[in-house]
């Protein structure tokens, strides 16, 4: 098989591709991000980084490969850089940056029913308990049908 993929130059903001073996069929390019603690992920065609809902758990991607059809896979246009998870999950502080499915909803720190202390403490302190630091985990007791019925009578 001969030929090579085109140089992947229309990259999303802050994404970097390193292609040490060039662009021939079978060659791989490593994905990385220009910013501290950011990760490269795949998003659906019509979703941008600003639009990611908290419940979406995008797939991390480490490389793209030049296929026999002379196309990059995954397509570089679908790869974005997002803030990575900070290593403070399950530490009894609700970290706004980790309060999403991608970071396992901060290991339960943002819901009263799952945080070990049974009291949600936001980080940073300015984080809104009805906003970025709200209980979002769909598996939490707060979101069970039984609890919702209870609230409706309350």
């Amino acid at each position: 098989m001969q030929g090579q993929c085109s140089v992947p130059n229309e990259l999303n903001s802050n994404l970097k591709l390193q292609c040490p073996d060039g662009y021939a069929i079978g060659s791989e390019c490593a994905t990385s991000c220009l910013d501290h603690n950011s990760e490269s992920i795949i998003l659906p065609m019509n979703v941008t980084v600003r639009d990611i809902p908290h419940w979406l758990n995008p797939t991390r991607v480490e490389r793209v490969v030049c296929t026999a059809g002379l196309k990059w896979y995954p397509h570089p246009a679908l790869i974005h850089c997002v803030k990575g998870c900070e290593p403070f999950m399950g530490d009894n502080y609700c970290d706004a940056i980790n309060n999403r499915a991608f970071c396992n909803y901060d290991g339960g720190d943002c819901c009263t029913s799952t945080v070990k202390t049974k009291k949600v403490t936001p980080f940073p302190m300015s984080c809104d308990l009805q906003g970025d630091c709200a209980c979002r985990d769909p598996q939490a007791q707060e979101h069970s049908r039984k609890d919702l019925r209870g609230y409706s009578h309350g």
């Epitope: 802050n14 220009l34 910013d35 501290h36 603690n37 600003r50 900070e86 290593p87 403070f88 970290d95 940056i97 980080f123 940073p124 302190m125 300015s126 984080c127």
Partner: antibody, heavy 122, light 106 residues
């Protein structure tokens, strides 16, 4: 208490490479929670971020300086270093090293060295 | 690159005055913004992080507000030791500093 101390030559000739080291005391540079960075301030002007390095060695740079900057870390000496190549008079500044991290300060720079003046002149 | 525009570039005020400094980002940075104080010949000192969280040991007369693109640093009652230059800094994407605001004695 964490302290940072810059060291290196105060005078560098044009076209040469500026080399500075920041020694960290009172804490470990290998802590995974922090980035270690360089900031400069030309005489009478504002602050300019140069770049940062994590304990794992990942580096991040100001796009306008990226082609000339190298930042490295030596965990055994609890130090990190800056190299800026092909310097000109415009690189004359006070150079600061600083720490940033998610905790406790949301990637703000919560600890700084006192700064070292570097003059580029022949 | 994210640009930060501070205003005013300088302000003259008296002890006891309320001083407000603004910082505008060229794009949405959520609350990834910090404020620093710098005195001549000294390194900057962190005052506020995450737009409105007061750094430990900083007097409560300093406060920060805002999110997105518009941010404010307020000194509720200016003290003699507060005459200095103040900088904002974003950490949403790499790092950028604002141009600075010098608070001078009227």
């Amino acid at each position: 208490q964490l302290q940072l101390q810059e060291s290196g030559p105060g005078l560098v000739k044009p076209s040469e490479t500026l080399s500075l080291t920041c020694t960290v005391s009172g804490g470990s540079i290998s802590s995974s929670s922090y980035n270690w960075g360089w900031i400069r301030q030309p005489p009478g002007k504002g602050l300019e971020w140069i770049g940062s390095i994590s304990s794992s060695g990942s580096t991040y740079f100001n796009p306008s300086l990226k082609s000339r900057v190298t930042i490295s870390v030596d965990t055994s000496k609890n130090q990190f270093s800056l190299k800026l190549s092909s310097v000109t008079a415009a690189d004359t500044a006070v150079y600061y090293c600083a720490r940033s991290g998610y905790r406790p300060s949301f990637y703000a720079m919560d600890a700084w060295g006192q700064g070292t003046t570097v003059t580029v002149s022949s | 690159d994210i640009q930060l525009t501070q205003s005013p570039s300088s302000v003259s005020a008296s002890v006891g005055d309320r001083v407000t400094i603004t910082c505008r980002a060229s794009q949405d940075i959520s609350y990834w913004l910090a404020w620093y104080q710098q005195k001549p010949g000294k390194a900057p000192k962190l005052l506020i992080y995450a737009a409105s969280s007061l750094q430990s040991g900083v007097p409560s007369r300093f406060s920060g507000s805002g999110s997105g693109t518009d941010f404010t640093l307020t000194i509720s009652s200016l003290q003699p030791e507060d005459f200095a230059t103040y900088y904002c800094q974003q950490a949403y994407l790499l790092h950028t500093f604002g141009g600075g605001t010098k608070v001078e004695i009227k």
